[in-house]
């Protein structure tokens, strides 16, 4: 059984009158229909919530909105609707919240039917003032602030024009008419895809891709043919149709779509999809949807410049496009990802990689947990986790697992001990090293959050009931204290709490349960007089990330380096704080074959770290396009896996000879590339 | 198998400093915490402080914080503990212990391998 | 830091007996907790670790248990070798040691 409230755990003291103290309600004065929450900036504490409610009329649906904001992390909120004057938010764009600590927020609004445009309303104080903007156009997207300048706008309008705005929305312009996607690249650059004929849908496949450096004042045409593309860490992906038949490609690019290279991965036909997984600057996860309606594909991993792909994990569950996948990265280790694979016997298993899909492995089964029924072995089982796949399929799972950067190791999720995944009811696990172990935190299924970088965690039970009660653990979820927060319990809708994980604040969303009217509440709970000190050194532990097996000298060793980190012990109760650092200690590795992917056209055999030829490709040169070449590779087998820092210890060369030939891909040969100004 | 060699019996004056040393034979050194631990004549055990080899990343008890040093040399397999400032009561038997260690916690789990002590006497 | 506190400091007993002995934290350790047999002349030996895990070659007679604030060490049946000096160890702070159980001949 999990552990829990027992006389074992080290209660805080005092802790119902510290948290009652801490405890502020607010009650919305709103009849219930959806509300959006939306942080502005970081550490401000501004918080805005958007409420709406339709009004089903005889011939068309009234909405009303109402906007508050708080600005101590959602203790008190203050009606600012006439800040906006008292217009129909849109809520399917959202709150459009600046960049960083840019304190801008865009608002777009409802408008009649006959109107020329639609109307913004614009904060650049953090939503103390609003400035309200007719545009020239119907937006269909939510805009899109740029990543490096918060004043540069774009969004695509009903009309399929894309507009940019300079001046944070004042004024609009209409760069460029047939407008399928856009998006921001690095340094304000957007790229965007046209059609020339009927419309996005009728052109798929005979898309161009376009690129504009300088808000629209010129453009180049960087791509032909084109179904879709993508931006994932320094990578610009392009999937190209082919010239003979219906399959595509994907091509990639490092330097904003000047050079493209083919991309070594299987080709896909109409029905198919590949999907960016995950990218960073050093390489890119890859999903290839697998002939037929699978509802799986093989996940590749790539080199550094997103061109040679090897062989992650196959059968990898991925319904059709645009559907569920479990991929999750554990963003309190480096190197870790979970996801699901569809077993031959349609059972779904999940499967974790600690070394960046190199290798992967089933979770080890939790010490204080049985196996299930789904279970041919009482004794030998592993832990399955649910994740988006088990969300869409409605099962009682309220919560996609959860790991924050500056909570080491913690990874929490909902999940089942057996064979597979099960339907039954779900308990909640939690890992404090990143995944290599696991323990049942919770029984049942609960909402859960994790504040003050890990130093409390916070869970309330998914239930179908009215709730009061609140749970939390100082010791990373190994004991747990209940604290009723209301007298009258409320039907619960979800834990808010800042993004990052370092806040003491945590935001309980319901409705009141009265029998005649549901109104919006809201209580927020400060933990800081829980945590009464800030914690000092002597509060820490050195912790050894990924070790296995402390008798190998390269314990610990994971893409070439290892890794210290001073962790919170479990036993002190105090405060992180906000400004909390990680503190991590790198040292180098030795190299060993582990820190080499299998080259193109070879392949590790199961439980070996060698590489070896595919049968099909044995003898064979190895011919790929990079830069609108041909290359030939000549390769021993391996090449360093991206991010890998090793020095010294074993180091198989590869060579790549260039035969400065030209591609065989027609895929936007110099010749056909153009510019055009405005 | 791994052990742990102390250095020999010390004699000091008060106000003067002693470096005791611990060289690891057979196993890993570098990946296992080495704590010191001292005991005075008829008394109890008493934790000094400690420090992992890899990054030389050593933490003391406040008791000692600001007289004793702890360092390790990772290619001599070795840890030194030194006390400064000693007075009477720093007379005592003086033991070098290796962290066992079963994750990645370098303190967690016990002193699995102890040396055979060194005792200090401090005597003007 | 966490205090650690054991009892009794004296404990007097015969080969053959079942023998406890308790430790006390000053809050809550989890389950960081070791026991330690000690010899005169000699240095400590480890006997459990986590509070309840035996140490590899120590005989079975050895168990622990606990969490959270109260552990107990006990001997199911003392032999004539299990006189010594028997110490806790709180490993989830800086590392305090009980101040020692003296288990001797009845």
């Known amino acids: 059984s999990a552990p829990g409230e027992d006389e074992e755990c080290g209660r805080v003291r005092d802790f119902v009158a510290k948290l009652a103290n801490n405890t502020h309600q607010h009650v919305f004065d709103d009849l219930r229909g959806s509300v959006s929450l939306s942080w502005v900036g970081d550490s401000t504490g501004v918080i805005l919530v958007l409420t709406t409610f339709h009004v089903p009329l005889v011939i068309m649906t009234f909405g009303q909105s109402k906007l508050y904001r708080s600005e101590d992390y959602g203790k008190n909120f203050k009606d600012i609707t006439d800040l906006i004057n008292n217009t129909f938010i849109r809520t399917e764009f959202g709150m459009a919240i600046g960049p960083e600590n840019s304190g801008k927020v865009v608002l777009t609004a409802e408008v009649s039917g006959g109107s020329r445009g639609g109307r913004i309303f614009r904060s650049s104080d953090f939503a103390k003032n609003f400035v309200q903007t007719d545009l020239p156009f119907h937006p269909l997207t939510q805009m899109m602030y740029s990543p490096q300048n918060s004043d540069y706008l774009l969004a695509l309008s009903t009309e399929n024009g894309l507009w940019v705005s300079k001046n944070f929305g004042g004024k609009w312009e209409e760069i460029h008419k047939a407008v399928c996607l856009a998006k921001w690249g690095s340094d304000n650059t957007i790229f965007f895809t046209t059609y020339a004929n009927g419309s996005c849908k009728a052109d798929l496949g005979a898309l161009e891709l376009w690129r504009t450096s300088d808000l629209g004042k010129s453009f180049k045409t960087i791509g032909v043919k084109i179904y879709s593309f993508g931006l994932g860490g320094r990578f610009l992906f392009a999937s190209v149709m082919a010239d003979k038949d219906t399959t595509r490609r994907i091509h990639v690019s490092t330097d904003q779509g000047d050079t493209w290279s083919m991309a070594q991965l299987p080709s896909v036909g109409q029905e198919q999809f590949y999907s960016i997984l995950a990218a960073n600057d050093d390489m890119v996860f890859m999903h290839v949807d697998e002939p037929g309606d699978t509802g799986f594909g093989t996940i590749f991993t790539s080199d550094d410049r997103g061109i040679v792909y090897s062989k992650s994990l196959d059968r990898h569950l991925y319904t059709t496009t645009g559907g569920e996948t479990d991929f999750t990265n554990v963003t309190s280790l480096r190197g870790v990802y979970i996801t699901s694979v569809l077993s031959e016997d349609n059972s779904i298993q999940t499967m974790i990689t600690f070394d960046q899909g190199g290798r992967w492995t089933h979770l080890r089964k939790p010490e204080n947990s049985e196996c299930d029924a789904t279970a041919k072995n009482k004794n030998e089982c592993s832990l399955h986790i649910h994740a988006s796949y088990s969300i869409s399929q409605k099962l009682n799972v309220p919560m996609a697992p959860l790991s924050e950067p500056n909570a080491v190791g913690i990874v929490i999720a909902h999940g089942s001990v057996g064979d597979a995944i099960s339907v039954m009811v779900p308990d909640v696990y939690i890992s404090d090293d990143g995944g290599y172990s696991w323990t049942k935190m919770l029984e049942g299924p609960h909402y859960y959050t994790i504040l003050d970088s890990g130093g409390i965690i916070v869970a309330i039970e998914h239930s179908s009931r009215p709730i009061n009660v609140i749970k939390f653990s100082t010791d990373e979820g190994q004991c747990w204290q209940t604290y009723t927060f209301t007298r009258d319990p409320i039907y619960f809708t979800g834990l808010a709490s800042e993004p990052g994980a370092r806040s003491m604040n945590i935001s309980i969303w319901g409705f009141t349960a009265s029998f005649l009217t549901s109104q919006w509440v809201s209580y927020t709970i400060d933990f800081k007089d829980i945590l009464e000190r800030n914690c000092e050194e002597k509060d820490y532990t050195i912790w050894l990330a990924h070790s296995t097996d402390p008798e190998d000298y390269e314990d610990g060793c994971i893409l070439g380096y290892k890794e210290q980190f001073l962790r919170l012990r479990k036993s002190s109760v105090c405060q992180n704080g906000r400004d909390y650092v990680v503190t991590k200690q790198p040292s180098i590795c030795l190299c060993s074959l582990e820190d080499f992917l299998c080259d193109f056209g070879y392949y590790r055999p199961e439980n070996d770290s060698k590489c070896v030829e595919q049968p099909e490709l044995k003898g064979h040169d190895l011919e790929f396009c990079l830069y609108g070449r041909e290359e030939h590779l000549t390769t021993n087998g391996y090449r360093k896996i991206p991010g890998d820092k090793c020095q010294g210890g074993v180091n198989p060369v590869r060579e790549v000879k260039d035969l400065k030939k030209k591609c065989t891909s027609n895929f936007l040969s110099p010749e056909k590339q153009n510019s055009k100004s405005n | 198998q791994v052990q742990l060699v102390q250095s020999g019996a010390e004699v000091k004056k008060p106000g003067s400093s002693v470096k005791v040393s611990c060289k690891a034979s057979g196993g890993t050194f570098r990946n296992y915490a080495i704590s010191w631990v001292r005991q005075a004549p008829g008394q109890g055990l008493e934790w000094m402080g400690g420090?992992?080899?890899?990054?030389?990343?050593?933490n003391y008890a406040q008791k000692f914080q600001g007289r004793v040093t702890i360092t390790a040399d990772e290619s001599t397999s070795t840890a030194y503990m030194e006390l400064s400032s000693l007075r009477s009561e720093d007379t005592a038997v003086y033991y070098c212990a290796r962290q066992g260690r079963k994750t990645g916690y370098y303190y967690y789990y016990g002193m699995d391998v102890w040396g055979q002590g060194t005792t200090v006497t401090v005597s003007s | 830091d966490i205090q650690m506190t054991q009892s009794p400091s004296t404990l007097s007993a015969s080969v053959g007996d079942r023998v406890t002995i308790t430790c006390r934290a000053s809050?809550?350790?989890?389950?960081?907790l070791a026991w330690y047999q000690q010899k005169p002349g000699k240095a400590p030996k480890l006997l459990i670790y986590?509070?309840?895990s035996l140490e590899s070659g120590v005989p079975s007679r050895f168990s622990g248990s606990g969490s959270g604030t109260e552990f107990t060490l006990t001997i199911s049946s003392l032999q004539p070798d299990d006189f010594a000096t028997y110490y806790c160890q709180q490993a989830d702070g800086h590392i305090t040691f009980g101040g020692g159980t003296k288990v001797e001949i009845k």
């Open positions: 986590k509070a309840s």
């Open positions: 420090i992992i080899p890899i990054g030389g990343w050593a």
């Open positions: 809050q809550s350790i989890s389950s960081w």
